[in-house]
Interface confidence: medium
Amino acid sequence: RDTTVKPGAKKDTKDSRPKLPQTLSRGWGDQLIWTQTYEEALYKSKTSNKPLMIIHHLDECPHSQALKKVFAENKEIQKLAEQFVLLNLVYETTDKHLSPDGQYVPRIMFVDPSLTVRADITGRYSNRLYAYEPADTALLLDNMKKALKLLKTEL
């Protein structure tokens, strides 16, 4: 299937990286810089040549809460996350590439700066390929490292 996503036409001011309000972190890492929208995240990923990490979650979901706790408290994850464009969402986007096997939460997906969804970077659960549990921090770290190895794209 085609896993290349199309960014919106939204423009962004170049080289402006103000510290965003902590509310955008929603508790996933207050010291990290989080983007506000999917379109903005795609734009930043493409222009900065950094992969995008998208976390879909819900505040009322206990699994989301549990994963958020270990994500925010794990120093390695927080450090590695600095190398990503970051987005956490409590709603679904219209991009079906971000829910290839369902709109469950929490799920974590990666998008290459070439705007290709990294469908190959999966968790360990067959029912929910992009789900992670609190015990999966080592796997998530490995997957983040995989995502940092950017896809080679032909010019």
Partner: antibody
Framework: QIQLVQSGPELKKPGETVKISCKAS????????MNWVKQAPGKGLKWMGW????????TYTEEFKGRFAFSLATSASTAYLQINNLRNEDTATYFC??????????WGQGTSVTVSS | DVVMTQTPLSLPVSLGDQASISCRSS???????????LHWFLQKPGQSPKLLIY???NRFSGVPDRFSGSGSGTDFTLKISRVEAEDLGVYFC?????????FGAGTKLELK
Amino acid sequence: QIQLVQSGPELKKPGETVKISCKASGYTFTNYGMNWVKQAPGKGLKWMGWINTDTGKPTYTEEFKGRFAFSLATSASTAYLQINNLRNEDTATYFCGRVTADSMDYWGQGTSVTVSS
Amino acid sequence: DVVMTQTPLSLPVSLGDQASISCRSSQSLVHSNGNIYLHWFLQKPGQSPKLLIYKVSNRFSGVPDRFSGSGSGTDFTLKISRVEAEDLGVYFCSQSTHVPLTFGAGTKLELK
């Protein structure tokens, strides 16, 4: 630790029904699908299909459509295989196996089903 | 269905020998997501199969490093660097790239 414990051996007559259980422990049951695999005496392994333990949706291979049914008791972290209208050729050991995104990592010990008149 | 052909069907060895088992698939096992879902299992008499190697070359937890897997596309190999008594049994390759999941017929590793 992760375990899949299956019910004991069964001796049945042709035409009868058997229901095998597979109780999971040591992990979140609804995060992993469950495979069912048949191994006839002296034969290889044959995948029968799987059940999505999250949605309860079963998927059967062509050979195992009709008389075979996968089901769940999610609250008891248990998967079931039921075989209706048993035939002699159903004599085999049946295994359940946990499905991960990568492979089938943990298997039950197997349940021997003997069909004989 | 994808046919998995294992060779040899029987492999007599002495303890300490290196053993090599081949598995060939009737079509490529490269998934559309780029992964290759080719796995190796060991089944000892009266027991259930145990996962040794998943996705061609990844050792499952607790599997000794004398076991290694390699291959690509349609040709895959399981190697045991120094056979120990506990390694005897039937080895199955399996693919889960395509539905239905299929297994090889098995290779019996036995003492000479």
